[in-house]
């Protein structure tokens, strides 16, 4: 059994694709996409957007357990990611594509999610990369919010206003789980797929991938 894609890579399975991972300290399993090509491989993909084929305006339970297809658009699941990152130091890489053919990334040298009792609060340190010098995930980290669980710092309900589950602040500079807008409809969309410190307020991105890997890989 494998805890993450880094373990799979180190076992000699170095082809990108869908693999079965096992929750730490349990027999519960989850299917994930492993990127074995990007930057040395061993990346466990925890989120992917590319075409709007999957609805990301989901409930707390769905974000907790995961949804979508690892071959396409999906969310791996907050509970698995929380358990995985609480017992080991992980880096988070966020890969972004715009509609003009440009790509950028943000790399956080330490990433973990608190447990459900703390609303899967995100913790990040050590930002580098090309998608902005300032973190587009508010610091210090926010609690996770969904349409049926409002944990943000806004009088409004950010998840309702901007759609999707995310670590909203009030409402903050990013939402990679926002409404997917096709090309030519992707500007001036404040509920789109946003990464402010790369593309600004109203720009909705073409594709996003969030992936994690042990810091000592």
């Amino acid at each position: 059994t494998f805890r993450d894609c880094a373990e799979i890579f180190k076992s000699g399975l170095t082809t990108s694709g869908i693999y079965t991972l096992t929750f730490p300290n349990s027999t519960e399993e989850v299917k994930a996409y492993c990127d074995m090509d990007m930057g040395g491989g061993g990346w466990t993909v925890i989120q992917h957007r590319e075409d709007g084929s999957v609805d990301f305006q989901r409930t707390w339970k769905e974000y907790k357990e995961g949804f979508g297809s690892p071959l396409g658009e999906y969310w791996l699941g907050n509970e698995f990611v929380s358990q995985l990152t609480s017992g080991h130091r992980y880096v988070l890489k966020i890969q972004l594509k715009d509609w003009e053919g440009s790509e950028a990334h943000s790399l956080y040298e330490h990433f973990y999610l608190s447990g459900e009792e703390s609303n899967y609060r995100i913790h990040l340190t050590g930002l580098t990369g090309t998608a902005g010098k300032i973190s587009s995930i508010s610091q210090p980290g926010s609690d996770f919010s969904t349409k049926d669980s409002d944990n943000d710092k806004c009088i409004c309900k950010c998840s309702q206003m901007l759609t999707g589950g995310w670590w909203f602040d009030a409402c903050g500079p990013s939402n990679l789980n926002g409404q997917y807008y096709p090309q030519k409809q992707n500007t001036n969309k404040f509920n789109g797929i946003k990464w402010y410190y790369w593309k600004g307020s109203g720009y909705s991105l073409k594709a996003t991938t969030m992936m994690i890997r042990p810091a000592d890989f």
Partner: antibody
Framework: QVQLVQSGAEVKKPGASVKVSCKAS????????MVWVRQAPGQGLEWMGY????????GYNQKFEGRVTMTTDTSTSTAYMELRSLRSDDTAVYYC??????????????WGQGTLVTVSS | DIQMTQSPSSVSASVGDRVTITCKAS??????VAWYQQKPGKAPKLLIY???TRDTGVPSRFSGSGSGTDFTLTISSLQPEDFATYYC?????????FGGGTKVEIK
């Protein structure tokens, strides 16, 4: 205190252009989006667009697309709105206003005093 | 664009009266509604945002309510300085739009 001071009244001929300025003071200029709203005589308010002084990003009301350009000069904390190919129905008071948030164009908490632009032959 | 239909377009009232202004959105705008007061020759002034939150320094006689498509601004006891025009504004969807205004006049 937080203040937006706009340039003075203008009289323009049809087909001409006008550039209105809005100087901000009392806050960090790049921390908030700026919007432009106009009001024709005796009429309601009409949102024209916004500019993000932090990165120069803009978003325009489709009604004005191609005729309006919004810019900023962060060294002087000034926003500008240029409207081209003026028509008589562009006669209005033009307001700049600050949004309460950098990341979204929410509500407008501070307004300039307005600039009357009259378009007449 | 989302249409914001304000009513009434004008209302005559006396000092001390309770005045209610309504705004109806053409589609769901959650609670993304603000209210502004405008006096002749002056710029609008923010009163209420997120449908019911008073801006700093706004007297407690002003209150807002509503969600979805129906919103209300209430002035509980009209004061002489409240005679003005009031506008609702939705910022849920691009482009932001305003109601046509309600003029509160002295009876």
């Amino acid at each position: 205190q937080v203040q937006l001071v706009q340039s003075g009244a203008e009289v323009k001929k049809p087909g001409a252009s006008v550039k209105v300025s809005c100087k901000a003071s009392g806050y960090s200029f790049t921390d908030y989006n700026m919007v432009w709203v106009r009001q024709a005589p005796g009429q309601g308010l009409e949102w024209m667009g916004y500019i993000d002084p932090y990165n120069g990003g803009t978003g325009y009301n489709q009604k004005f697309e191609g005729r309006v350009t919004m810019t900023t000069d962060t060294s002087t904390s000034t926003a500008y709105m240029e409207l081209r190919s003026l028509r008589s129905d562009d006669t209005a008071v033009y307001y700049c206003a600050r949004t309460r948030d950098r990341y979204d164009v929410w509500y407008f908490d501070v307004w300039g005093q307005g600039t009357l632009v009259t378009v007449s032959s | 664009d989302i249409q914001m239909t304000q009513s009434p377009s004008s209302v005559s009232a006396s000092v001390g009266d309770r005045v209610t202004i309504t705004c109806k959105a053409s589609q769901d705008v959650y609670i993304a509604v603000a209210w502004y007061q405008q006096k002749p020759g002056k710029a609008p002034k923010l009163l209420i945002y997120w449908a019911s939150t008073r801006d700093t320094g706004v007297p407690s006689r002003f209150s807002g309510s509503g969600s979805g498509t129906d919103f209300t601004l209430t002035i509980s006891s009209l004061q002489p300085e409240d005679f003005a025009t009031y506008y609702c504004h939705q910022y849920s969807s691009y482009p932001p739009t305003f109601g046509g205004g309600t003029k509160v006049e002295i009876k």
